[in-house]
């Protein structure tokens, strides 16, 4: 007996061919001998089966001796043996219908688990193999689970169900809800405007939720909430903002925050959380601010940085177009009795300059000028 696999919700076509290449009488029945459909002359007739409104044939093939049974919007319970009676002979086709669904929602937060459940007809023993968008293969029986979803798991999962040496393929689109970056760092000179951006790694029609930015300044003993906001259909509205600093927030996505001035007392780390409507858990993005200040007090030229810097970062003071006078893996460097000229304070990582501040040292009878 021929075996045909179908997918829940899909359409399947079961073939029945007569030796005579012309339109003759045929009937399709199920295993209980209940008539599904057939013909009477050139008319399509339907029986009392539960498939009545979902069964059809392809009349255009009748003249060629082909009498297919089309079943639309397949259900698991349509799995059965179907019998085509034509020319005093019977052709049997076993139809097995499978369904594959994601546990709850196909939009999952980063770090959550994905469970795929296979619906299969009684008596079947299928095996399932799924391939994630990043090429990871998982195998299982009735359920497959993937814990700790990552951003790279977003996309189309291709799952193959194998039964009786035949296969049927399912494609499930999974969206992992996360920020594009888990962490970011902004380097600014004192007094400069600071832009923080929190782009999302997904797009959805409607996005509603609420968020907050907590900030732990390096100089402060505890963290504090800098801003809270609401998100409604991708429109951002500020609920509450601290007086110091007075952050500004963009009204549209991506989430965008502006700090009017980078000051040493603001240097530190922040955690932006976003709680999405109808989702348990929150999205997180860490943001860091490093602030640099170069000053000259009497005979001392000082360069300082505040904020979360890695121990391998190098802080240097150098006279323009000259070798560095001082370079240290520390957060402050200074030069006593600096020569007159344009001095540069550089924060660098393996030779790559991350932040630079210039200060003009005038001959000793003048006062210093900061450009």
């Amino acid at each position: 007996k021929k075996v045909v696999l179908g997918k829940k919700g899909d359409t399947v076509e079961l073939t029945c061919t007569a030796s005579q290449k012309k339109s003759i009488q045929f009937h399709w029945k199920n295993s209980n001998q209940i008539k599904i459909l057939g013909n009477q002359g050139s008319f399509l007739t339907k029986g009392p089966s539960k498939l009545n409104d979902r069964a059809d044939s392809r009349r255009s093939l009748w003249d060629q001796g082909n009498f297919p049974l089309i079943i639309k919007n397949l259900k698991i319970e349509d799995s059965d043996t179907y019998i085509c009676e034509v020319e005093d002979q019977k052709e049997e086709v076993q139809l097995l219908v499978f369904g594959l669904t994601a546990n709850s929602d196909t939009h999952l937060l980063q770090g959550q688990s994905l469970t795929l459940t296979l619906e299969s007809p009684p008596g079947s023993s299928p095996s399932v193999q799924c391939r994630s968008p990043r090429g990871k293969n998982i195998q299982g029986g009735k359920t497959l689970s993937v814990s700790q979803l990552e951003l790279q798991d977003s996309g189309t999962w291709t799952c193959t169900v194998l039964q009786n040496q035949k296969k049927v393929e399912f494609k499930i689109d999974i969206v992992v809800l996360a920020f594009q970056k888990a962490s970011s760092i902004v380097y600014k000179k004192e007094g400069e405007q600071v832009e923080f951006s929190f782009p999302l790694a997904f797009t959805v029609e409607k996005l509603t939720g609420s968020g907050e930015l907590w900030w732990q300044a390096e100089r402060a003993s505890s963290s504090k909430s800098w801003i809270t906001f609401d998100l409604k259909n991708k429109e951002v509205s500020v609920k509450r903002v601290t007086q110091d600093p007075k952050l500004q927030m963009g009204k549209k996505l991506p989430l965008h925050l502006t700090l009017p001035q980078a000051l040493p007392q603001y240097a530190g780390s922040g955690n932006l959380t976003l709680a999405l409507e109808a989702k348990t858990g929150k999205l997180h993005q860490e943001v860091n601010l490093v602030v640099m200040r170069a000053t000259q007090l009497q005979k001392n030229l000082t360069c300082e940085v505040w904020g979360p810097t890695s121990p391998k970062l190098m802080l240097s003071l150098k006279l323009e177009n000259k070798e560095a006078k001082v370079s240290k893996r520390e957060k402050a460097v200074w030069v006593l009795n600096p020569e007159a000229g344009m001095w540069q304070c550089l924060l660098s990582d393996s030779g790559q300059v991350l932040l630079e501040s210039n200060i003009k040292v005038l001959p000793t009878w003048s006062t210093p000028v900061q450009p």
């Epitope: 997918k7 359409t11 399947v12 073939t15 050139s42 059809d56 009349r59 255009s60 393929e169």
Partner: antibody, heavy 120, light 106 residues
């Protein structure tokens, strides 16, 4: 999005064969019939035959029986139509088209067409 | 095979006109009739299936009617992009198409 992409134009000599491919994407390949329709220059549309990609079953219009062969490769979601014993009147644009979900034997998505020129 | 005859073979009309194309089957085909639009150098596009059902994405100015042997395609108010060739096709028996109706700008 759902699309059918066909192979490029061919020039053949009378008596030769031509094999045109039609690659499906954006839907479950095995669910819907693929049909072949041709159109001679300046003429109307002529239905050639069908394939059920799920079972591999095929059928063709009486005019083409014995000359047309349809095959499929489910691993690449591709259907092939081979026409043999070519004659000059087979010069045409050959289209593949798929059935819609709603009704059999209407053609809701078409390939871009493959021009086959038969000339000595 | 069932013969499908379209009339007229060609017609000229202006933007904004109401246009009707007819298709006659050589025997009764119930409502197993589809209509297509084809522009030069392009593949045909399904407009209407089952005689009167508008295909998804097709503008509502297109409509189809008829059953048995006589069918019509109506464009209520011609738009510049509607100038093309129109084909009817039956699927009651082995698929056959009408010879086409060329709709030109007057």
């Amino acid at each position: 999005q759902v699309q059918l992409v066909q192979s490029g134009a061919e020039v053949k000599k009378p008596g030769a064969s031509v094999k045109v491919s039609c690659k499906a994407s954006g839907y479950t390949f095995t669910t819907y019939y693929i049909h072949w329709v041709r159109q001679a220059p300046g003429q109307g549309l002529e239905w050639m035959g069908w394939m059920n990609p799920n079972t591999g079953d095929t059928g063709s219009a009486q005019k083409f029986q014995g000359r047309v062969t349809m095959t499929r490769d489910t691993s690449t979601s591709t259907v092939y139509m081979e026409l043999s014993s070519l004659r000059s009147e087979d010069t045409a644009v050959y289209y593949c088209a798929k059935d819609p979900a709603v009704t059999p034997d209407a053609f809701d998505i078409w390939g871009q067409g493959t021009m086959v020129t038969v000339s000595s | 095979d069932i013969q499908m005859t379209q009339s007229p073979s060609s017609l000229s009309a202006s933007v904004g006109d109401r246009v009707t194309i007819t298709c006659r089957a050589s025997q009764s085909i119930s409502t197993y009739l589809n209509w297509y639009q084809q522009k030069p150098g392009k593949a045909p596009k399904l407009l209407i299936y089952a005689a009167s059902t508008l295909q998804s994405g097709v503008p509502s100015r297109f409509s189809g009617s008829g059953s048995g042997t006589d069918f019509t395609l109506t464009i209520s108010s011609l738009q510049p992009e509607d100038f093309a060739t129109y084909y009817c096709q039956q699927s009651y028996r082995t698929v056959t198409f009408g010879q086409g109706t060329r709709l030109e700008i007057k």
